[in-house]
């Protein structure tokens, strides 16, 4: 029997009597920014080097009694979760600790910044293998802390942080809200979001994935052989830091973008009960629980994609929302979603030399989200082909006309406020998979990509009667790159990708008559690249 | 107050500095902004991170910090530079009165200023 959390993150093929996956992260150094730690604890002795970095505020209260074991409690436990001999995730990883939290578990943004700077300087002075930085802390949204995390991430460091224990939108906290950081929420043994007193794990679009974070057994600072169970998003983040160390040890050349995509890809999908989250956050919160890959090698040939939601646009008439991919990722499609259904679609546009996904709110709308499908596609050459609104009644169409380019996504946006009202649906002619179609009042945008061995196909699922949700999934071996609704359905709230499934949402069916307008068709573009392994070798 | 002598020593150095001129107007068309934590109990007024524009060199950061000290001293305010950032972000950490924010925002190379705030173990 092994602790539930280690069992949960271990793929079945590793599960023996004891948790001993191959290569315990020995090529990786994990930096921990936390409280002081008890480095002579049996779990972490010889594995954790305590740096001389310390930047902490005074403890609150005049009668505060500094007790070493309490001062070390949080950091010691987390060091144990990451690399502990008996209860750690990455038993081979070496760690370095920086003290940025005082004996009450409190620190400052400035102290954390100076700590991150210390790590960057250490990296420059003595470059080692891959670095993982664990930030098991949270404060209010901080532009400067997020900016520092971005800089460190762009220097090749993997940052993992706690989503926060405030039962709130993680985007309101830092460093959880930094896009470059891997932000981790907490789940329990039942794969449910963790409740902590009256609060609990944070959630929302700024969370990348969840990991075990309740009743986690680890090193206790009460004695050098003591164990303790603790709960929180810090513990969840420590699991992901350990998994990241394992992955990087197996594949030291992985970029942050590749690592994040793999973490998402190998996670357990759709196991979290979303009813725990506020209704408006459910669609934005990833239903993913972290796990080690079943094999540390051989994932290179797969086409990895993830869904990135924008912040909410706000309700003003001309409001827009922008979703961006990471620097190493390709934007392969763009969709939009509005709870009120009032939106003016979306488009892919260039911004600072990169494509972004922009969604447009409509008059009377409560606001929109832009949803980007961000993929790892080495040697890709992607462009957007646009067709302005058509005069013909057949609607607007655009296709990928360049030799070797395949269609990866379709978007449409329109200036009129109520596109499609009293208009019959426009059907896409069969046998033309490289074509996007739309209303004659809409501009249609096709994302067209050329990459070695890339092939794509269109898959549709239509339901004649109105339904709140229509889905279509890509089969095994294919990856969803594009997700949209076939035009002609005026009550569509939008489309978005959830893992490998395209979801098209409609207004509550009770408000929609079952006319032909009620028909809803979800269109998925499914791609694969059987040459990604060779392509990545060629790049190296 | 702790380290008062140190503060005065810094102040004297700042007053002697050749940077004791009026602040140059920030680059045309850009206005530095001020940010603070939305959660009031977590705010730490009196300590500020002054973030400078991306390509600012360490020497310029130090010069900007000294200029702020000099101008603050001329207005009768004591300031203390707690740290000069370089390696990740150019800028500096300063202990000063909130009254000086307007002045600091007008310094050359300043991108934005953020009031320090608390972070917590999770």
């Amino acid at each position: 029997s092994i602790p539930w959390n280690l069992e949960r993150i271990t793929p079945p093929r590793y599960r023996a009597d004891e948790y001993q996956p191959p290569d315990g992260g020995s090529l990786v150094e994990v930096y921990l920014l936390d409280t002081s730690i008890q480095s002579d604890h049996r779990e972490i002795e010889g594995r954790v080097m305590v740096t001389d970095f310390e930047n902490v505020p005074e403890e609150d209260g005049t009668r505060f009694h500094r007790q070493a074991s309490k001062c070390d409690s949080h950091g010691t436990h987390l060091a144990g979760v990451v690399s502990g001999r008996d209860a750690g995730v990455a038993k081979g990883a070496s760690m370095r600790s920086l003290r940025v939290l005082n004996c009450q578990g409190k620190g400052t943004v400035s102290g954390t910044l100076i700590g991150l700077e210390f790590i960057r300087k250490s990296q420059l002075v003595q470059p080692v293998g891959p670095l993982v930085v664990l930030l098991p802390l949270a404060g209010g949204y901080s532009r400067v802390l997020n900016a520092a995390c971005q800089r460190l991430a762009r220097a090749g460091v993997v940052l993992v942080t706690a989503a926060g224990n405030f039962r709130d939108d993680a985007c309101l906290y830092s460093p959880a809200s930094a896009p470059e950081v891997i932000t981790v929420g907490a789940t329990n043994a039942q794969d449910q979001p963790v409740t902590l007193g009256t609060l609990g794990t944070n959630f929302g679009r700024c969370v990348d994935l969840f990991a075990p974070g309740e009743d986690i057994i680890g090193a206790s600072s009460d004695c050098s052989t003591c164990f303790v169970s603790q709960s929180g998003t810090s513990q969840a983040a420590a699991h992901v830091a350990g998994i990241a160390a394992m992955m990087l040890s197996a594949e030291p050349e992985l970029t942050l973008a590749e690592l994040r995509q793999r973490l998402i890809h190998f996670s357990a999908k759709d196991v979290i009960n979303e009813a725990w989250f506020p209704e408006d956050q459910r669609v934005l919160t990833p239903n993913l629980v972290a796990a080690l890959p079943p094999s540390t090698h051989g994932a290179g040939w797969q086409l990895f994609c993830r869904t990135v939601w924008s912040a909410h646009s706000g309700p003003t008439r001309m409001a827009t929302a922008v979703a961006r991919c990471a620097p190493d990722e390709e934007l392969l499609s763009c969709s939009s979603f509005s709870r009120s259904g009032k939106r003016r679609g979306e488009r892919m546009e260039a911004q600072g030399g990169k494509l972004v996904c922009r969604a447009h709110n409509a008059f009377g709308g409560e606001g929109v989200y832009a949803i980007a499908r961000c993929c790892l596609l080495p040697q890709a050459n992607c462009s957007v082909h646009t067709a302005p609104p058509a005069e013909a009644s057949m609607g607007t169409r655009v296709h990928c006309h360049q030799q070797g380019h395949v269609l990866t996504g379709c978007s449409s946006h329109w200036e009129v406020e109520d596109l499609g009202t009293h208009k019959p649906p426009v059907l896409r002619p069969r046998g033309q998979p490289n074509q996007c179609v739309g209303h004659r009042e809409a501009s249609i945008h096709a994302s067209c990509c050329h990459a070695p061995g890339l092939e794509c196909k269109v898959k549709e699922h239509g339901i004649p009667a109105p339904q709140e949700q229509v889905t279509v999934a890509c089969e095994e071996g294919w990856t969803l790159t594009g997700c949209s609704a076939l035009p002609g359905t005026s009550h569509v709230l939008g489309a978005y990708a959830v893992d490998n499934t395209c979801v098209v949402r409609s207004r509550d069916v009770s408000t929609t008559g079952s006319t032909s307008e009620g028909a809803v068709t979800a269109v998925a573009i499914c791609c694969r690249s059987r040459h990604l392994a060779q392509a990545s070798q060629e790049l190296q | 107050q702790e380290d008062e002598d140190g503060d005065y020593e810094e102040l004297v150095l700042a007053l002697r500095s050749e940077e004791d001129g009026l602040a140059e107007a920030p680059e045309h068309g850009t206005t530095a902004t001020f940010h603070r934590c939305a959660k009031d109990p977590w705010r730490l007024p009196g300590t500020y991170v002054v973030v400078l524009k991306e390509e600012t060199h360490l020497s310029q950061s130090e010069r900007t910090a000294r200029r702020l000290q000099a101008q603050a001293a001329r207005r009768g305010y004591l300031t203390k530079i707690l740290h000069v950032f370089h390696g990740l972000l150019p800028g500096f950490l300063v202990k000063m009165s909130g009254d000086l924010l307007e002045l600091a925002l007008k310094l050359p190379h300043v991108d934005y200023i953020e009031e320090d705030s608390s972070v917590f173990a999770q």
């Epitope: 602790p3 902590l196 009460d222 004695c223 303790v228 603790q230 | -």
Partner: antibody, heavy 131, light 106 residues
């Protein structure tokens, strides 16, 4: 309150092995660690090793390394201690003892401390090694 | 291994006496020390844990103090049922016990 009930007295020949059992009742077995402590006639207490069923790992005192095996069976709430290559100086009363657990709050969380603090003991099993 | 040395190894006292037993660790063990009482033919009983915390159900005449290397068990007013052998035990490393202190009737 957890009760620990041990198996009966044993007489063994030198060079043989003995396996003593310790059954827990009245508590959640898997949330408690079990240690084994022995006491030779007229002597003090000596810790041999312990198992923490949550971690699924056993820890042994250097002196007994390689000679003692501690296991636990969660389905029957029973811990076992097997000592091999017995010699006359292994004649002693062998006790199983449960590690204590307390629950406190830190950072707004519940924390369970598992440590070598022996709050409940078995009645002891006398093992006599004699030719 | 951490060595624990108890003193005295035995003492004679009368009912109502204040009794002090000391325990010294060969290296610093924080507050990771427990005290036990053992009566003939019985299993030990936990009295004090973590250096100074009284185990529930144990009379308040028993108290513990100390941290680091030097620890003390005090019985403020010896009762007839207190005549027994007392052991200290550290748990900072693998557990080790002191050799015991026998408290006998004078």
């Amino acid at each position: 309150q957890v009760q620990l009930v041990q198996s009966g007295a044993e007489v063994k020949k030198p060079g043989s092995s003995v396996k003593v059992s310790c059954k827990a009742s009245g508590g959640t077995f898997n949330s408690h660690a079990i240690s084994w402590v022995r006491q030779a006639p007229g002597q003090g207490l000596e810790w041999m090793g312990g198992i923490n069923p949550i971690l699924g790992i056993a820890n042994y005192a250097q002196k007994f390394q390689g000679r003692v095996t501690i296991t636990a069976d969660e389905s029957t709430s029973t811990a076992y201690m097997e000592l091999s290559s017995l010699r006359s100086e292994d004649t002693a009363v062998y006790y199983c003892a449960r590690h204590y657990e307390i629950q406190i709050g830190r950072y707004g969380m519940n924390v369970y401390y598992l440590m070598y603090r022996f709050a409940s003991w078995g009645q002891g099993t006398l093992v006599t090694v004699s030719s | 291994d951490i060595q624990m040395t108890q003193s005295p190894s035995s003492l004679s006292a009368s009912v109502g006496d204040r009794v002090t037993i000391t325990c010294r660790a060969s290296q610093g063990i924080r507050s990771a020390l427990n005290w036990y009482q053992q009566k003939p033919g019985k299993a030990p009983k936990l009295l004090i844990y973590q250096g100074s915390t009284l185990q529930s159900g144990v009379p308040s005449r028993f108290s513990g103090s100390g941290s680091g290397t030097d620890f003390t068990l005090t019985i403020s007013s010896l009762q007839p049922e207190d005549f027994a052998v007392y052991y200290c035990q550290q748990f900072d490393g693998d557990p080790t016990f002191g050799q015991g202190t026998k408290v006998e009737i004078k």
